[in-house]
């Protein structure tokens, strides 16, 4: 039996990745990914590279980070005399094609691959201490690496439901992952939690012709709040709703809307019209690195064309960050769930509150999307 994923994560582009610690040959790694419904992962430039690096940096595997680890990826050199000078992959290529793919900002080679005209040759991703990616390393396909990376592709995902009053959240993804949080979940993912009074609740991500949503979820919240306010998706009290600048950082629970003062929630009908059953601050946050995090009702548009983004500094090992989402809030004050309120890429909010196209936007800032993905 194949072990469950040590870590996994999904981005709003529909791509999910899982990292597994298991000593096996390349062929066995390919089969293991296929059994999970995916394929051995490519690690191309840009968002994909950052996603995989984030998984690695989430924490060491077996051995506590004391040695270098080698992970099988979908990189190979077909039989025949490849050109070892062909930069940057030295003639190696990814198993699946991406006609528009750029390889310019790929990792370096730990050591130059040998020239060979006979056998198919494979390559691994070497991670220093098991967490810090060093680069590609040629490895004979029949040898055993320390682990492997899988990739899964979906047309649409379910953004994480807001907990509200829920506790003990648990995500079970279809690719055999049991996790404490996933910012984006593929169809088939089941989220279970406890509501107040220890009442269990379970919702499942389902996809149809309209898109993807959590069945049996009312108002985006797993468990309703006893009060009027939510902050970062969790129930909150009014005194906790002010940000560092004194702005209103909460949204109103279902049945309430933002009052005329712009910082209190009143019973629906007494204030102003609401959008999707929740009141949101009337103040439109500018799309800057230091602005408050917009609440969950902002629409998000997916993008895969990211500018260069800094990788996340020191984080708790149980949290994996994929830096593919807009820097809508200050990193230092964002909790895991706050980060899950945002989505991937260059979608930015304009002063009017609409979302700038991910595709022709020229902004390139991004905030990490975080999730705890300790395996069961």
């Amino acid at each position: 039996e194949h072990p469950t994923a040590d870590r996994a994560g999904c981005s709003a582009s529909g791509a999910c990745y899982s990292l597994h610690h298991a000593t096996m040959k390349r062929q066995a790694a390919e089969e293991a990914c296929i059994l999970r419904g995916g394929a051995l992962s490519t690690v191309r430039a840009g968002a994909e590279l950052r996603a995989v690096l984030a998984l690695l940096r989430a924490g060491p595997g077996p051995g506590g980070g004391s040695k270098d680890l080698l992970f099988w990826v979908a990189l190979q050199l077909p039989p025949g005399c490849g050109d070892p000078k062909r930069l940057p992959l030295r003639g190696f290529s990814w198993l699946s094609s991406d006609p528009g793919g750029l390889e310019s900002d790929t990792l370096q080679w730990v050591e130059e691959p040998q020239r060979s005209c006979t056998a198919r040759r494979c390559a691994v991703l070497q991670a220093t201490g098991g967490v810090e990616p060093a680069g590609w390393k040629e490895m004979r396909c029949h040898l055993r690496a320390n682990g492997y990376l899988c990739k899964y592709q979906f047309e649409v995902l379910c953004p994480a439901p807001r907990p509200g009053a829920a506790s003990n959240l648990s995500y079970r993804a279809p690719f055999q992952l049991h996790s404490a949080a996933l910012d984006f979940s593929p169809p088939g993912t089941e989220v279970s939690a406890l509501c107040r009074g220890q009442l269990p609740i379970s919702v499942t991500c389902i996809a149809d012709e309209i898109g993807a949503r959590w069945d049996k979820l009312s108002g985006d919240v797993l468990c309703p709040c006893p009060g009027r306010y939510l902050r970062a998706g969790k129930c909150a009290e009014l005194p906790n709703c002010l940000d560092d600048l004194g702005g209103f950082a909460c949204e109103c629970a279902t049945g309430f809307e933002l009052g005329k003062d712009g910082r209190s929630c009143v019973t629906s009908g007494e204030g102003q019209p609401t959008l999707g059953g929740t009141g949101v601050p009337t103040r439109r946050p500018p799309a800057t690195a230091t602005s408050p995090v917009p609440q969950r009702t902002w629409p998000i548009r997916v993008d895969e064309k990211l500018g260069e983004t800094p990788l996340v500094p020191e984080q708790d090992n149980s949290v994996t960050s994929i830096p593919e989402i807009p820097r809508w809030g200050s990193q230092s004050t964002m909790s895991t769930l706050q980060m899950s309120l945002q989505a991937e890429s260059k979608a930015t909010i304009t002063p009017s509150g609409s979302v700038i196209s991910k595709f022709n936007s020229t902004t390139s800032s991004a905030t990490p999307q975080a999730f705890d993905s300790s395996s069961a």
Epitope: E155, I210, G211, E304
Partner: antibody, heavy 127, light 106 residues
Framework: EVQGVESGGGLVQPKGSLKLSCAAS????????MHWVCQAPGKGLEWVAR??????????YYADSVKDRFTISRDDSQSMLYLQMNNLKTEDTAMYYC??????????????????WGQGTSVTVSS | EIVLTQSPAIMSASPGEKVTITCSAS?????MHWFQQKPGTSPKLWIY???NLASGVPARFSGSGSGTSYSLTISRMEAEDAATYYC?????????FGAGTKLELK
């Protein structure tokens, strides 16, 4: 920049055939579902066909009016979308657009929407 | 199939005027998308999932509705808003569009 450039349109006789192509660029084509939508001269928009991505087994869907006559297909390695049109009728005369099906996230849901349209290729069926 | 009926078919509005275009579905649909098309150009996604403005759409536009009744509203008409607007449902196959509402500047 996301683009879809259609080609292959032209004048064809009734019962004839035509193959439309759409060269997509600026996005990861193989992860998106795609559509063909047509617009007869001076008329409204009419959905023709949809093809999903590999992750959904390239499932295809058609408008009743084109079923068994038109075939939508794709070549992910070339980022190409196709529409094979057989047994053409005069009422098929229209501008044909290749359309990307984008995904938008709002709240805890994801929504499909036809978000990028090519410039269109004109098909005229006439004797 | 679900038939979408837009009204009015043609209308004109003066700058600053409030404009409402409605779309009625023959059966209940979950959401409605709206597209804008100007002569000689391809349609553009304008409002998705009933009420969300697509990229670059001015805030004077809004969308609302549920079930069989949906609408697109312009709070204050501007010259650049003159175009044809189409509603579209994707709750069931075949995907269908409304016949369009041509909005002219008075």
């Amino acid at each position: 920049e996301v683009q879809g450039v259609e080609s292959g349109g032209g004048l064809v006789q009734p019962k004839g055939s035509l193959k439309l192509s759409c060269a997509a660029s600026g996005f990861t084509f193989n992860t998106y579902a795609m559509h063909w939508v047509c617009q007869a001269p001076g008329k409204g928009l009419e959905w023709v066909a949809r093809i999903r991505s590999k992750s959904n087994n390239y499932a295809t869907y058609y408008a009743d009016s084109v079923k068994d006559r038109f075939t939508i297909s794709r070549d992910d390695s070339q980022s190409m979308l196709y529409l094979q049109m057989n047994n053409l009728k005069t009422e098929d005369t229209a501008m044909y657009y290749c359309v990307r099906e984008g995904v938008y996230y709002y709240g805890s849901s994801g929504y499909y929407a036809m978000d990028y349209w090519g410039q269109g290729t004109s098909v005229t069926v006439s004797s | 199939e679900i038939v979408l009926t837009q009204s009015p078919a043609i209308m004109s509005a003066s700058p600053g005027e409030k404009v409402t275009i409605t779309c009625s579905a023959s059966s209940s649909v979950s959401y409605m998308h709206w597209f804008q098309q100007k002569p000689g150009t391809s349609p553009k996604l304008w409002i998705y999932s009933t009420s969300n403005l697509a990229s670059g759409v001015p805030a004077r536009f809004s969308g609302s509705g549920s079930g069989t009744s949906y609408s697109l509203t312009i709070s204050r008409m501007e010259a650049e808003d003159a175009a044809t607007y189409y509603c579209q449902q994707r709750s069931s196959y075949p995907l269908t569009f409304g016949a369009g509402t041509k909005l002219e500047l008075k």
